[in-house]
């Protein structure tokens, strides 16, 4: 195609030299996922109020959810690279049983819930391909999954709605710190 | 695949204005991150600005105030909007497409800026 006025085109890169890093890519997609989490924390907070209730220590006990702990080796002060990376994956194995929760508690936003649940499985898959332990790595049993999303269908409206603001509220600081860590790997 | 054709660029005096648009093919526009990324000869590619899904906008350092970046979900384009142009801007511009449900990334051929008066 002809370049256009005031353009040089030898100095214009094909766009195969240009592809992103590993470590770009995670960014980017890790980025992605906060964008959507962001997206949908919107209509969770513009439906209930659950986001100024001081009642979220009740829900909370029903939830396990995948916190960033000092033995991690994910913070600044005991960073531990292969450690931490085992911590991120099985933590997002352990998220996706509740981001399959997710899915059907969103009106208006459904497709940015079925986006966030599909890119963090493709994070997980960039992750696996970057940890050299796998072996570290616990996949968590189908059939306890299950029975746990079985458990949070059955709650009433209310609980409902605070497992879903405590879900968000979590995986989104669990991938903030995430991406802090991976950041200095 | 997406494809992305990036235009807008040319040669303007330091203080000037110019446009860059990025339009992109195919039906997942709306859920695609668009980036702007620019490389000086001899130089790494950095990112100048992002603008996200929810339209979240994000601009590098030297040069917010100056850039400011757009999407229009309707016609499937991105923009980049460039004031104030100093030489230093002078690089090849990408737009990059990031489709995070596949982890896919997709780039222009690039759009050659110079700013010389």
């Known amino acids: 195609a002809p370049v256009p006025p005031g353009e040089d085109s030898k100095d214009v890169a094909a766009p195969h030299r240009q592809p992103l890093t590993s470590s770009e890519r995670i960014d980017k997609q890790i980025r992605y996922i906060l964008d959507g989490i962001s997206a949908l924390r919107k209509e969770t907070c513009n439906k209930s109020n659950m986001c100024e209730s001081s009642k979220e220590a009740l829900a909370e006990n029903n939830l396990n959810l995948p916190k960033m702990a000092e033995k991690d080796g994910c913070f600044q002060s005991g960073f531990n690279e292969e450690t931490c990376l085992v911590k991120i994956i099985t933590g997002l194995l352990e998220f996706e049983v509740y981001l399959e929760y997710l899915q059907n508690r969103f009106e208006s936003s459904e497709e940015q819930a079925r986006a966030v649940q599909m890119s963090t499985k493709v994070l997980i898959q960039f992750l696996q391909k970057k940890a050299k332990n796998l072996d570290a790595i616990t996949t968590p049993d189908p059939t306890t999954n299950a029975s746990l999303l079985t458990k949070l269908q059955a709650q009433n409206q209310w609980l409902q709605d605070m497992t879903t603001h405590l879900i968000l509220r979590s995986f989104k600081e669990f991938l903030q710190s995430s991406l802090r860590a991976l950041r200095q790997m | 695949a997406v494809q992305l054709v990036d235009s807008g660029g040319g040669l303007v005096q330091p203080g000037g204005s110019l446009r860059l648009s990025c339009a992109a093919s195919g039906s997942i526009f709306s859920r695609l991150a668009m980036d702007w990324y620019r490389q000086a000869p001899g130089k790494q590619r950095e990112l100048v600005a992002s603008?996200?899904?929810?339209?979240?906008?994000m601009l590098d350092d030297s040069v917010k105030g100056r850039f400011t970046i757009s999407r229009d979900n309707a016609e499937n384009t991105v923009y980049l909007q460039m004031n104030s142009l100093k030489p230093e801007d002078t690089a090849v511009y990408y737009c990059m497409a990031f489709d995070g449900y596949t982890g896919s990334d997709y780039w222009g051929r690039g759009t050659q800026v110079t700013v010389s008066s």
């Open positions: 603008i996200a899904v929810s339209g979240t906008t």
